[in-house]
């Protein structure tokens, strides 16, 4: 049996392909006949499924040059807080438990993304632990009025994350130390194993594997919402918007943004992955009567999709009788 192939390297040249190169084994132990290349899609980090990206004023932004991800801060006008009474000096308020917890989560959030795609070289994934499936009680549809608390991370379990393991696929490579693996998903991490096989392979088997992790490039348009946005009227001056999710997104859809308004689309609503998975859309509350337009945009691991075409909806004014009742 030959020794393992050496110096396995992989790079992506498109959103559906990985190029893999390696060197022959140092000990072929006979005539090298062929290599077996095996590849397996890797699950996304569980944190990406559980984290509620609507609770942050930050979104992950991919830097294409070096494959890393940065956190882009959305800074609002600084608010002056009065801490020491009407005219007293302004001081730092003591942190609440919830704020301390939120800071801890923020640190974890940063760590995940600073390590994310580091130089496109990946280490083997440790065994994943089973997680309890817990429904989150009283998950509100609107993130607009929520304060950022320790609920930035959901315990709700995404079906995709539940013990997901993907099959290995194989191909045989004759007389060369490179191959192109095709039909892959965009912006997705793969483990690639290479085995060397000599003339005795049928009888004695092939070598153990040498392996590498690599991620495909993002695909243009993969994060675009594929179908029409529809709406249904709901009681109490609210409506429910529904839309289909991108079928083959760049890695994972983290959240959706809704831009809506009556004259101009000046209102924004963020819908987390978890909320979308639970409801298939989002509810817009406390709308004044009138005609509205709305557009939706998905945000994936690699950035934003396109805004959808506008959907037109209206909120009816309550009749006098209804107003009287209420």
């Amino acid at each position: 049996v030959p020794s393992i192939p050496l110096d396995v390297l992989s790079a992506s040249n498109s959103s559906s392909q990985l190029i893999v190169k390696w060197n022959p084994p140092s000990l072929p132990n006979g005539n090298l006949s062929y290599y077996i290349v095996r590849w397996q899609r890797q699950p996304q980090d569980g944190y990406l499924y559980r984290h509620n990206y609507c609770s942050k004023d930050k979104i992950p932004i991919r830097k294409y040059a070096d494959g890393t991800i940065d956190i882009e801060e959305v800074t609002e006008n600084p608010k002056t807080e009065v801490c020491g009474g009407e005219k007293g000096p302004c001081c730092a308020c003591p942190k609440t438990e919830a704020e301390k917890q939120a800071e801890k989560e923020e640190a974890e959030y940063r760590k995940v993304f600073e390590n994310f795609l580091h130089n496109s070289i990946f280490v083997p994934r440790p065994e994943r632990k089973r997680r309890d499936v817990m429904q989150v009680a009283n998950t509100t549809m609107s993130s607009r009025s929520r304060n950022t608390t320790a609920a930035d991370t959901y315990n709700i379990t995404d079906p995709e994350e539940l013990e997901t393991e993907y099959p290995f696929f194989e191909s045989r490579v004759d007389n060369k130390e490179r191959t192109v693996i095709s039909n892959l998903r965009p912006f997705t991490l793969y483990r690639i194993d290479i085995h060397s096989c000599n003339h005795e392979a049928e009888k004695l088997g092939c070598s153990a594997s040498n392996f590498v992790f690599a991620r495909t490039m993002p695909a243009e348009g993969a994060d675009d919402i594929p179908g029409p946005v529809t709406w249904e009227p709901r009681p109490e001056n609210s409506i429910f918007l529904k839309w289909p999710e991108p079928e083959n997104p760049n890695g994972l859809i983290l959240m959706y943004e809704i831009k809506y308004g009556s004259q101009v689309e000046d209102q924004r609503e963020c819908v987390s992955r978890q909320e979308y998975r639970k409801y298939g859309g989002a509810k817009l509350n406390r709308l004044n009567p009138g005609n509205y337009t709305a557009r939706i945009q998905a945000t994936s691991l690699s950035g934003n999709g396109s805004w959808t075409d506008p959907v037109f909806f209206y909120v009816q004014a309550k009749t006098g009788y209804e107003n009287f009742i209420h």
């Epitope: 099959p167 194989e170 392979a201 049928e202 009888k203 088997g205």
Partner: antibody, heavy 121, light 107 residues
């Protein structure tokens, strides 16, 4: 033309083990993956696991993990599936099946005739 | 695991007619889907792979379509030998899973 020949029917007691064999004749054996799929009477098909003899690598469905062992003997072109701690629900026809092609793994174009395993006290 | 749901459970058709049956996945499987035919006392036989490609030796009257979560197998003109049970199977995630089957019987 390659054929997969399976061992004969077995009757087993609950708690015991069964080992079913699948011999390939008439062609290449080692480089193709062999899967085991079972079918309870009047029921659908259920994938149990798979081995690539040339690599000696086996993968199992979570449901059977720890209870099933799939091995292969390259010298005799035979794959084996051993299922332990048998219970009555394991009564089924057990098929071995070969991958369609290397680049079309997980579709099965060649099947054995099946081995009926009956678990009864 | 991905649950594959086939409908209808039984289809009564006359020879020469067209038969269409459906397979739905609980989450997207792309085009990673196969169809098999199984006759009583026999092993399954691969008909279609990757949702729409006919396997070697399969007559042109068998065709497959669909992607994502919804798939269809069509037999354009039923021959007497086509009366059997038909299963779909996904290979997108482990474990591989099969649908519950559609039995095609003579009307």
């Amino acid at each position: 033309q390659v054929q997969l020949q399976q061992s004969g029917a077995e009757v087993k007691k609950p708690g015991s083990s069964v080992k079913v064999s699948c011999k390939a004749s008439g062609g290449t054996f080692s480089s193709y993956a062999i899967s085991w799929v079972r079918q309870a009477p009047g029921q659908g098909l259920e994938w149990m696991g798979r081995i690539i003899p040339i690599l000696g690598i086996a993968n199992y469905a979570q449901k059977f993990q720890g209870r099933v062992t799939i091995t292969a003997d390259k010298s005799t072109s035979t794959a084996y599936m051993e299922l332990s701690s048998l219970r009555s629900e394991d009564t089924a026809v057990y098929y071995c099946a070969r991958d369609h092609r290397f680049d079309y793994a997980w579709y099965f174009d060649l099947w054995g005739r099946g081995t009926l395993v009956t678990v009864s006290s | 695991e991905i649950v594959m749901t086939q409908s209808p459970a039984t289809l009564s058709v006359s020879p020469g007619e067209r038969a269409t049956f459906s397979c739905r996945a609980s989450q997207s499987v792309g085009s990673n889907l196969a169809w098999y035919q199984q006759k009583p006392g026999q092993a399954p036989r691969l008909l279609i792979y990757d949702a729409s490609n006919r396997a070697t030796g399969i007559p042109a009257r068998f065709s497959g379509s669909g992607s994502g979560t919804d798939f269809t197998l069509t037999i354009s003109r039923l021959e007497p030998e086509d009366f059997a049970v038909y299963y779909c199977q996904q290979r997108s995630n482990w474990p591989l899973t099969f649908g519950g089957g559609t039995k095609v019987e003579i009307k």
